[in-house]
Interface confidence: medium
């Protein structure tokens, strides 16, 4: 069973290497457990960046991942990826799985192209 | 690190709902542990159908999945998906990860379009 997942097409990371974007899904369905996975697509390769499971009680996610954070509210997840460098520029896809109770639904967004520009190194200040 | 994964573009499931296709990767690389994941892509959704890890000793995979089976030989996996119905028609991607020893390599095929036609129900024979 499929759900529709929407995410912005382009996001610019801050100079500190932080990119934030929402990931929304519909229909919201009556779900007690939602699994959100962020994947990075490069050519034909898909790499898992981070994943977490949200519940009604557990609305702050990615506690196991130092470079991802997220909050969950109804059918919207606000994602933040930090520690990004220019080499991390790429397409980041949000995958949403409505895990429980049945039926299982899954959807994947079209991806958010995150552009990261490395800051110029600061001159030594004596 | 990326590897190239090849799989046929189209396969027709049998009338019993069984589809078989090879998934090959190159370069083969000296690998003790290969993880193969079959994903189904529908529109922008990617669903994991089944996954298994092959080793030199464990060349028969997907024992945990009633609808997938596969055998592994060198750099080729012969995949079989059964229990398919017309609603399961879609693009099935083979993802290969060379897990161990380092370096980690990953690749994803372009997908095999599996067409499934439900058989006409047989008339009751008394």
């Amino acid at each position: 069973e499929a759900i529709q997942v929407t995410q912005p097409s382009v996001v610019l990371a801050s100079s500190h290497g932080v990119a934030s974007f929402p990931c929304e899904y519909s229909p919201s369905h009556n779900t007690d457990e939602v699994r959100v996975t962020v994947l990075r697509q490069t050519n034909d390769q898909m790499t898992e960046v981070c994943a977490t499971t949200f519940t009604e009680k557990n609305t702050v996610g990615f506690l196991d991942y130092p470079f991802c954070s997220g909050t969950f509210n109804e059918s919207r997840v606000n994602l933040t990826i930090q520690g990004l460098r220019a080499v991390d520029t790429g397409l980041y896809l949000c995958k949403v799985e409505l895990m429980y109770p049945p039926p299982y639904f899954v959807g994947m967004g079209n991806g958010t192209q995150i552009y990261v520009i490395d800051p110029e190194p600061c001159p030594d200040s004596d | 690190e990326a590897i190239q994964v090849t799989q046929p573009s189209v396969v027709l499931a049998s009338s019993h709902g069984v589809a078989s296709f090879p998934c090959e990767y190159s370069p083969s690389h000296n690998t003790d542990e290969v993880r193969v994941t079959v994903l189904r892509q529908t529109n922008d959704q990617m669903t994991e159908v089944c996954a298994t890890t092959f080793t030199e000793k464990n060349t028969v995979g997907f024992l945990d999945y009633p609808f997938c089976s596969g055998t592994f030989n060198e750099s080729r996996v012969n995949l079989t998906i059964q229990g398919l119905r017309a609603v399961d028609t879609g693009l099935y991607l083979c993802k290969v990860e060379l897990m161990y020893p380092p370096p980690y390599f990953v690749g994803m095929g372009n997908g095999t379009q599996i067409y499934v036609i439900d058989p006409e129900p047989c008339p009751d024979s008394d």
Epitope: T55, M99 | Y65, P66
Partner: antibody, heavy 120, light 112 residues
Framework: EVQLLESGGGLVQPGGSLRLSCAAS????????MNWVRQAPGKGLEWVSA????????YYADSVKGRFTISRDNSKNTLYLQMNSLRAEDTAVYYC?????????????WGQGTLVTVSS | QSVLTQPPSASGTPGQRVTISCTGS?????????VHWYQQLPGTAPKLLIY???QRPSGVPDRFSGSKSGTSASLAISGLRSEDEADYYC???????????FGGGTKLTVLG
């Protein structure tokens, strides 16, 4: 190979408590929701409770709500059922069963069961 | 009283075809949830026989088949054998009860 092994059954008096365990092996335990299903002597199957893979969501049949608590320890690959305020009608063989989720859920694998007898 | 309704018993002679029905409601089978069938041989745990309405796990003979229509489902066993003598249960998820529901079970007897 998937294996589910229940333990903790036995004879208990009405109003008493019992804790059942189900040791799982042969699969990634935390990826699967788990269930308890019971069968009274000579009767049919009755679903008792379910818990999602992370343990964040729990579900109970009306007949046990408020008395039974399902939990899991993913680090130990073990499922539990804490049964309090037991009644004679809770007498049954208790099975743990594993959900499948890839194309839809179903109870794919069952343990051999553990017998709980509530009697004075 | 089970949420899914099955006949309490069924019987047939070796080689015959028998069908076991399972009737539900709009909150389970009628809501689109798949029906699964379990076989329980005497003194053993239930074993998955049919999943997703009509799919057989590996190792289950093709003599067993399942179908679903509307709010009901059925299990057919052709070429009946003595080892098929067992209890058969249907199951589905029920979204109003937020749990699995079972049929009351059908005891299949192979005569002769």
């Amino acid at each position: 190979e998937v294996q589910l092994l229940e333990s903790g059954g036995g004879l208990v008096q009405p109003g008493g408590s019992l804790r059942l365990s189900c040791a799982a092996s042969g699969f990634t335990f935390s990826s699967y929701s788990m269930n308890w299903v019971r069968q009274a002597p000579g009767k049919g199957l009755e679903w008792v409770s379910a818990i999602s893979g992370s343990g964040g969501s729990t579900y109970y049949a009306d007949s046990v709500k408020g008395r039974f608590t399902i939990s899991r320890d993913n680090s130990k690959n073990t499922l539990y059922l804490q049964m309090n305020s037991l009644r004679a009608e809770d007498t049954a063989v208790y099975y743990c069963a594993r959900d499948r989720v890839e194309m839809n859920q179903w109870l794919a694998d069952w343990g051999q069961g553990t017998l709980v007898t509530v009697s004075s | 009283q089970s949420v899914l309704t099955q006949p309490p018993s069924a019987s047939g002679t070796p080689g015959q075809r028998v069908t076991i029905s399972c009737t539900g409601s709009s909150s389970n089978i009628g809501a689109g949830y798949d029906v699964h069938w379990y076989q329980q041989l005497p003194g053993t745990a239930p074993k998955l026989l049919i999943y997703r309405n009509n799919q057989r796990p590996s190792g289950v003979p093709d003599r067993f088949s399942g179908s679903k229509s509307g709010t009901s489902a059925s299990l057919a066993i052709s070429g009946l054998r003595s080892e098929d003598e067992a209890d058969y249960y249907c199951a589905a998820w029920d979204d109003s009860l937020n749990g699995w529901v079972f049929g009351g079970g059908t005891k299949l007897t192979v005569l002769g």
